[in-house]
Amino acid sequence: FEIALPRESNITVLIKLGTPTLLAKPCYIVISKRHITMLSIKSGERIVFTFSCQSPENHFVIEIQKNIDCMSGPCPFGEVQLQPSTSLLPTLNRTFIWDVKAHKSIGLELQFSIPRLRQIGPGESCPDGVTHSISGRIDATVVRIGTFCSNGTVSRIKMQEGVKMALHLPWFHPRNVSGFSIANRSSIKRLCIIESVFEGEGSATLMSANYPEGFPEDELMTWQFVVPAHLRASVSFLNFNLSNCERKEERVEYYIPGSTTNPEVFKLEDKQPGNMAGNFNLSLQGCDQDAQSPGILRLQFQVLVQHPQNESNKIYVVDLSNERAMSLTIEPRPVKQSRKFVPGCFVCLESRTCSSNLTLTSGSKHKISFLCDDLTRLWMNVEKTISCTDHRYCQRKSYSLQVPSDILHLPVELHDFSWKLLVPKDRLSLVLVPAQKLQQHTHEKPCNTSFSYLVASAIPSQDLYFGSFCPGGSIKQIQVKQNISVTLRTFAPSFQQEASRQGLTVSFIPYFKEEGVFTVTPDTKSKVYLRTPNWDRGLPSLTSVSWNISVPRDQVACLTFFKERSGVVCQTGRAFMIIQEQRTRAEEIFSLDEDVLPKPSFHHHSFWVNISNCSPTSGKQLDLLFSVTLTPRTVDLT
């Protein structure tokens, strides 16, 4: 090899050992029979050398640094050449470094030809191994602007006072052009400006200078986004840290052409704007930090550019002004992550503040719109609390548990609507009366409706789930001792059509001691399956539940248990079941932890089934499933 550097070129070439590898044979640079491991060639020098091994790329790296001084004379602006040409250099991992020094008042602009650049974060690497590391200068301090790969959106980076650009090329890479040019600009009066150009839909992740370390104190950095007018941009902060400010406030400012409120100022913790049409600027402004405990300011954010969706021009009014203690959340439904670009899916408040989820609270009227390619990617969850604090006022009072029509008219599927029903302890209980009798969901007879009611205790310490119930069964009402949550959960978009089938009334009734009482009025046509609460986890310790089962005069009920034994093992107390005829009060008592369960029994009159648990040993829980079937009486036994 012969490397000759022109006298005034301000180029230095350094060949040195790379990261040490466990290669058996060492390798040397050979210059007139001398074996060395480092070679430095300066401007005006000409050196001939070879390598002592066949694969020097496994041992050595080469650095070519060009110092460009714009302080003392004119600056060589224009396309930057790779000097010396890559064809004259050994095939080693090579880094070309351009160090440009300029006056504070001079702006320098790096322009990147296609492909543009894509910023990468710490620990990331570029697929083709080609990286661009760019840093600036504040007085004597070097500031890392970022590390970039090819195939992105960054087209220009403007700085002042100097710039250092390092282009790293792997030994096998055929690239023979720098891919950028330098131009002079007037002072930019800030650390840097990064221009990001979108030709179509896409996303860009960008970071504050020095990321993940701290952004320089009291500095200003701007990103300019060039977005076709027919597309919409949304900003989301992926990661940020705030420093401890002594004076001024850390903030981001948006300049949105056409906005009457420019610049729009946001705190970093605010929801960032979305659904912006066309170009916009985003600036990060630091503060004067506390000298004793400065902390760090850093920001990593994503800009998502996509077509406006049909829904984005529609405004939906959600009137919660007459509601109390209610919150509605629109959020992404859980999905498997895919690796290809997926357009964002946002919900916007007043068309501007867009985010992937939004919570609306009662007491106000809200205007929302959607910026989303596919609204099935979102769902709604609503929570409403109905509480009674004064038992004298609430007793016998009823409330309808209905999904408000405003919510049903939204173009997003309702997932859960939860009512938290709270009563004064030991004073009142609750009764749920459905518009249509309910069926309890069991493996033997699953619900196949578009929605179900999930009923569970709302007492934090109590793990009691009464079950899942859907319209079209035999359960006429459910009485519960204390606080519960009733969740209407939808399972199919057809819920919108079936919404009329929903309807549950809750009333506050005098307090009773049993955990729950189910009133069952079986139909002659079908078998009713019933199971104890907390199925699969076992009825909680010392809990008592009853079923009030009606038998019409001309029918006989067959009560069947689906196991021979309950399987419960008591640590303390006894688990028992009482079957009591309501007319004669005659009762049978079964010890569930000892006796076998009764064989199928026939009941000519309405009867009670009461199950009371002991304190079971873990793993030996009380779970019972039974059925009631009506058949016509053949002989009148009255």
């Epitope: 390598f51 066949q54 694969s55 020097p56 496994n58 050994p90 096998f172």
Partner: nanobody
Framework: QVQLVESGGGLVQAGGSLRLSCAAS????????MGWYRQAPGKQRELVVV???????NYADSVKGRFTISRDNAKNTVYLQMNSLKPEDTAVYYC?????????WGKGTQVTVSS
């Protein structure tokens, strides 16, 4: 004098396969890194795949899973098996050998993929 001669190019329909060969002269071959590159009309020459002297390979994203590099040391030949070809694979394909820090190029072989 180190010489690399490519062969095996031609016209193939989209979805078809081709196998390119690169015969290397003498001592360059054994223990040297070898690679395949391509240049489409009006475009920069780009890496297809390179195999380092240690045997590790580096494929361009656009060919991963479709192209495979292999070599026969006894015949001083490196191969490029190209499957599921696409019209955008149309280019002149060059073989490159790395020897004592020098990168030697072959003269290239034309591959045309018709749709």
């Amino acid at each position: 004098q180190v010489q690399l001669v490519e062969s095996g190019g031609g016209l193939v329909q989209a979805g078809g396969s081709l196998r390119l060969s690169c015969a290397a002269s003498g001592s360059i071959f054994s223990g040297s890194a070898m690679g395949w590159y391509r240049q489409a009309p009006g475009k920069q020459r780009e890496l297809v795949v390179v195999e380092s002297s240690g045997g590790s390979t580096n494929y361009a994203d656009s060919v991963k899973g479709r192209f495979t590099i292999s070599r026969d040391n006894a015949k001083n030949t490196v191969y490029l098996q190209m499957n599921s070809l696409k019209p955008e694979d149309t280019a002149v394909y060059y073989c490159r050998g790395f020897y004592y820090g020098m990168g030697y190029w072959g003269k290239g072989t034309q591959v045309t993929v018709s749709s």
